[in-house]
């Protein structure tokens, strides 16, 4: 019977032979035939000989061919096929016979060994994946592992082993992504061949065309568009262009791949047209495709016959900004091609040379950190030299300034000044701003609070009243005036409020405003009837047994928590001792008074007495000290004894009894041992030290005695007063 397919001398689908042996394979068929060999067997190999088909078999009507492979090697393992040569009349399906030859070698269980660098195997999730670790013997047991320590075990369904093909994974998943290795142990020796599965994705991350749209060119120039497609590492793309001249193949297109990025692939397609013409203007589209993924990017190309410049104001010709702004953009509306050279002038000079704060950005001049110096005329100069085109346009910039009050910026005192009661005061605000600010003066009255918990207070947010020279609010105003002055090279307005008579405490405010904003300076106007707002007085230096009387007066707007303390120095440290039984402080119109009375003082009460009050504004405790030295007591003594004395009737006389002692002695007068009281005609002088008798009569004659007494004792002196002449009562009457 005729052989529909060639017949091989080795029967079956596979045959195992040992390495080093000779493979002898004969093919017999009805027609001329050829051999197909594994890729690892080279037709030029000296060890291989194939006889051309020659007549054989019954009646020499068959064709026979012999394949001989001397000293076969492990890598000669594979499929050997004998097939009929196709004829022009033959419409049969391919007629062939194959046998898989295993060239077994214990030293080379794998046909291909990938040890130094793993072999890359592309995979698509959900599709079949073959890890091609083919073996040289069907009996070799192979294990598939995934680095570092997973084992992929054949289950006969999803993962199967085929000694001719390797491991077949029916539908690959992410679990098969990685460094895989096939392991086989032969005669106690471990063999490994490595594969790196590479998942192919269709992820196009980005498509861009450079230069950005619109692309402008002059007739005759070269158009170069670079389309860049960024993809995941495992993505490959096809790139194509649509453009006006595509039908006539106007452009040349070059493609390249940039693999220098560690986590992406970047594909480039560069379109180039030399000597562009009007017909090349229009839409250029770069199309990027990867599997089912597609992205495109458009750019528009304009081709101009010749250059042009047109410039207009983007805003008004006169623009305003404010000093202190982080930046201001002076911008012009420019249409020009090709890109002109740009120079900005400020008041006729190149702006960027004037200040590093001036930056040119496109057709804009950006002024950083605007100041008043930036006011002026700005001119944009535009020039296209090759086209001999030049244009310019000027804009004026006004820099407005929010009002500033100079006195606010100079460091103010931590606590407000005090204005003496009844004094004339001049209050000044020096103001600067553009436009020139309007200045008004305001009055905020103080609110009195007579409760014990709260002190009188003034606040800035209370009701306020606008003042004019005729205002009768608060204090009498002498004048409100304004004058211009140049300070540090700038025009400033000095506004002056003159208070004629300081009587009423409150807050004066000068308010300066223009269209940019308002600023206010508050001047706390605290009137004081106490010198420097804090005064301590001692009635007199007491002697032992007398009363000590101290008085402390503080300005009520500046101080609170008033108290008397006694300072004592112990071991070089000053101790503050509180004094008990202090009286309540009393509040008056402008001040708080605290009196301290210590009755019947002794020498131990000597010391430094201090009045302490807390400054409301600084929180600081202020002390005013006074030294008290209690004088030692001393028995009275007379500076001069009384002496007998004669006086004429109807005359007048003075008896003097000057005594000293500590405390100052009390003086008592006696006449004939009877205490003298002041009565008409008898006058006791200061401290009873003098006795004055007017219109002396006979009855005034007698023994006069003065006694000086204090705690320490008493002393006395006596004298006889003689009245000369007789009394003429009738005449008197």
């Amino acid at each position: 019977s005729k052989l529909k397919v060639p017949e091989l001398s080795l029967k079956g689908t596979q045959h195992v032979m040992q390495a080093g042996q000779t493979l002898f394979l004969k093919c017999r068929g009805e027609a001329a035939h050829s051999w197909s060999l594994p890729t690892t067997v080279s037709q030029e190999d000296k060890r291989l000989s194939i006889t051309p088909p020659s007549a054989c078999g019954r009646d020499n009507r068959q064709f026979c061919s012999t394949l001989t492979l001397d000293t076969a090697q492990a890598n000669h393992t594979g499929l050997y096929t004998c097939r009929y040569l196709p004829t022009s009349t033959s419409k049969k399906k391919k007629a062939e016979s194959s046998i898989y030859i295993f060239v077994s070698d214990a030293g080379s269980p794998f046909i291909e060994m990938h040890t130094d660098i793993p072999k890359l195997v592309h995979m698509t999730e959900g599709r079949q994946l073959i890890i091609p670790c083919r073996v040289t013997s069907p009996n070799v047991t192979v294990t598939l592992k995934k680095f570092p320590f997973d084992t992929l075990t054949p289950d006969g369904q999803r993962i199967t082993w085929d000694s001719r093909r390797g491991f077949i994974i029916a539908n690959a998943t992410y679990k098969e992504i990685g460094l895989l290795n096939c392991e086989a142990t032969v005669n106690g020796h471990l063999y490994q061949t490595n594969y790196l599965t590479h998942r192919q994705t269709n992820t196009i991350l980005d498509v861009q065309i450079r230069p950005p749209s619109p692309v402008r060119l002059l007739h005759g120039q070269t158009l170069v568009l670079n389309c860049t497609a960024t993809t995941e590492l495992n993505t490959r793309v096809q790139m194509s262009w649509n453009y006006p001249g595509k039908a006539t193949k106007r452009a040349s297109i070059r493609q390249r791949i940039d693999r220098s990025h560690s986590h992406n692939n970047v594909f480039h397609s560069v379109l180039k047209i030399n000597n562009v013409e009007s017909r090349d203007k229009g839409l250029y589209t770069c199309r990027v495709k990867s599997g089912s993924s597609f992205q495109s990017f458009n750019t528009s190309v304009h081709v101009y016959e010749k250059g042009f410049i047109s410039v207009k104001h983007r805003k008004q010709p006169v623009q305003e900004t404010t000093a202190g702004r982080r930046s201001y953009r002076l911008s012009m509306k420019v249409k020009a091609f090709p890109s002109p050279e740009i120079v900005w002038l400020k008041d006729g000079s190149p702006a960027t040379l004037k200040s590093a704060r001036y930056l040119v950005h496109g057709y804009s001049l950006i002024i950083k950190d605007v100041t008043t110096e930036d006011a002026g005329d700005y001119t944009i100069l535009l020039g296209i030299k090759q086209s001999r085109l030049f244009k310019n346009l000027t804009a004026t910039l006004i820099v407005n300034v929010k009002p500033q009050i100079y006195e606010k910026s100079v460091s103010s005192l931590p606590s407000p000044p005090l204005y003496p009661l009844g004094s004339r005061q001049v209050l000044t605000c020096t103001v600067y701003g553009i436009p020139r600010p309007t200045i008004t003066w305001l009055w905020h009255p103080c609110h009195h609070n007579h409760s014990k918990e709260r002190y009188d207070f003034c606040t800035e947010n209370e009701e306020s009243f606008i003042l004019d020279p005729s205002s009768n609010l608060g204090n009498r105003i002498e004048s409100i005036s304004q004058r211009m002055t140049v300070i540090e090279g700038t025009n400033k307005t000095v506004s002056t409020l003159v208070v004629a008579d300081s009587q009423t405490p409150g807050i004066y405010s000068c308010r300066a405003f223009n269209k940019i904003g308002t600023v206010e300076r508050n001047i706390k106007f605290y009137v004081t009837d106490v010198p420097n707002g804090f005064h301590v007085s001692l009635e007199k230096m007491p002697a032992e047994g007398e009363d000590l009387k101290l008085s402390c007066v503080v300005n009520k707007f500046l101080y609170r928590d008033i108290t008397w303390i006694l300072l004592r120095t112990v071991n070089n440290r000053t101790m503050h001792h509180s004094i008990s039984k202090q009286k309540m402080a009393t509040t008056q119109d402008y001040s708080i008074t605290l009196n301290l009375v210590i009755k019947n003082v002794s020498l131990e009460d000597s010391g430094t007495y201090a009045c302490r009050a807390r400054n409301i504004y600084t929180g600081e405790d202020i002390l005013r000290k006074t030294e008290v030295l209690v004088r030692d007591s001393e028995a009275p003594h007379l500076l001069q004894n009384l002496s007998d004395y004669e006086v004429s009737i109807s005359g007048s006389t003075t008896l003097d009894c000057q005594a000293r002692g500590v405390p100052a002695p009390q003086i008592t007068w006696f006449k004939n041992n009877h205490k003298i009281q002041q009565e008409p005609g008898i006058i006791l002088g200061p401290g009873n030290s003098t006795l004055f008798i007017e219109r002396v009569t006979e009855e005034d004659e007698g023994v006069y005695r003065c006694r000086a007494t204090n705690q320490k004792g008493a002393v006395e002196s006596a004298a006889y007063l003689t009245v000369q002449g007789t009394s003429d009562k009738s005449n008197l009457e």
């Epitope: 660098i117 320590f149 997973d150 992410y174 679990k175 990685g178 590492l233 560690s262 986590h263």
Partner: antibody, heavy 119, light 111 residues
Framework: EVQLLESGGGLVQPGGSLRLSCEAS????????MNWVRQAPGKGLEWVAT????????SHAPAVKGRFTISRDNSKNTAYVQMNSLRAEDSAVYYC????????????WGRGTTVTVSS | QSVLTQPPSASGTPGQRVTISCSGS????????VYWYQQLPGTAPKLLIY???QRPSGVPDRFSGSKSGTSASLAISGLQSEDEADYYC???????????FGGGTKLTVLG
């Protein structure tokens, strides 16, 4: 951008516990094995633990076996190491590392988080 | 004591070629791929060589790696001052079932 960010380090007393986290972004976290590597001050790199892509197989260095446990949560793109019975010699900068799939070495590293074990 | 052995230090002048060796055993270097890492002061390690001799993108071709049996080496040609760093070799160890590293080599660029 491919990134690993460790957190959870700090000062702990001997015998105490800490849990370090490593959050991944910018790559296919669930596909690759994750590692923890530590470096004591002035010393070299020391492998601590590795976990496979699915979180089903782990391996720990002998010095930490029984005390440290590596784990991962692929839904959160985060790997962890639970450290118990800490000792002074565990003080180090702890790095987590992975691969983005080309090299299968440690081609992605975090900045590290410092663990100090001291009383 | 590290599983892989590296010299603790190496040095060279700019432009010179330096080689750092790394020796191991059959359970690690011989049967697995060798990786080299560069660690600049105060930073995390960076992969320099993978699969014995391959360079990740961005690593200059002045760096090359090789492996033979149970040893591996890293060569740096045309030495530059920015190459001053610690260099570590690393590989998988089948018996440990984990990664192993060398003790590190401190490379100093002289002058």
């Amino acid at each position: 951008e491919v990134q690993l960010l460790e957190s959870g380090g700090g000062l702990v007393q001997p015998g105490g516990s800490l849990r370090l986290s490593c959050e991944a972004s910018g790559f296919d976290f669930s596909t690759y094995a994750m590692n923890w590597v530590r470096q004591a001050p002035g010393k070299g790199l020391e492998w601590v633990a590795t976990i496979n892509s699915e979180g089903t197989i782990t391996s720990h260095a002998p010095a930490v076996k029984g005390r440290f446990t590596i784990s991962r949560d692929n839904s959160k793109n985060t790997a962890y190491v639970q450290m118990n019975s800490l000792r002074a010699e565990d003080s180090a900068v702890y790095y987590c590392s992975s691969t983005t799939g080309t090299t299968h070495g440690m081609d992605v590293w975090g900045r590290g988080t410092t663990v100090t074990v001291s009383s | 004591q590290s599983v892989l052995t590296q010299p603790p230090s190496a040095s060279g002048t700019p432009g010179q070629r330096v080689t750092i060796s790394c020796s191991g055993s059959s359970s690690n270097i011989q049967n697995n791929y060798v990786y080299w890492y560069q660690q600049l002061p105060g930073t995390a390690p960076k992969l320099l060589i993978y699969f014995n001799s391959q360079r990740p993108s961005g690593v200059p071709d002045r760096f090359s790696g090789s492996k033979s049996g149970t040893s591996a080496s890293l060569a740096i040609s045309g030495l530059q001052s920015e190459d001053e760093a610690d260099y570590y070799c690393g590989t998988w160890d089948d018996s440990l079932n984990g990664w192993v590293f060398g003790g590190g080599t401190k490379l100093t660029v002289l002058g």
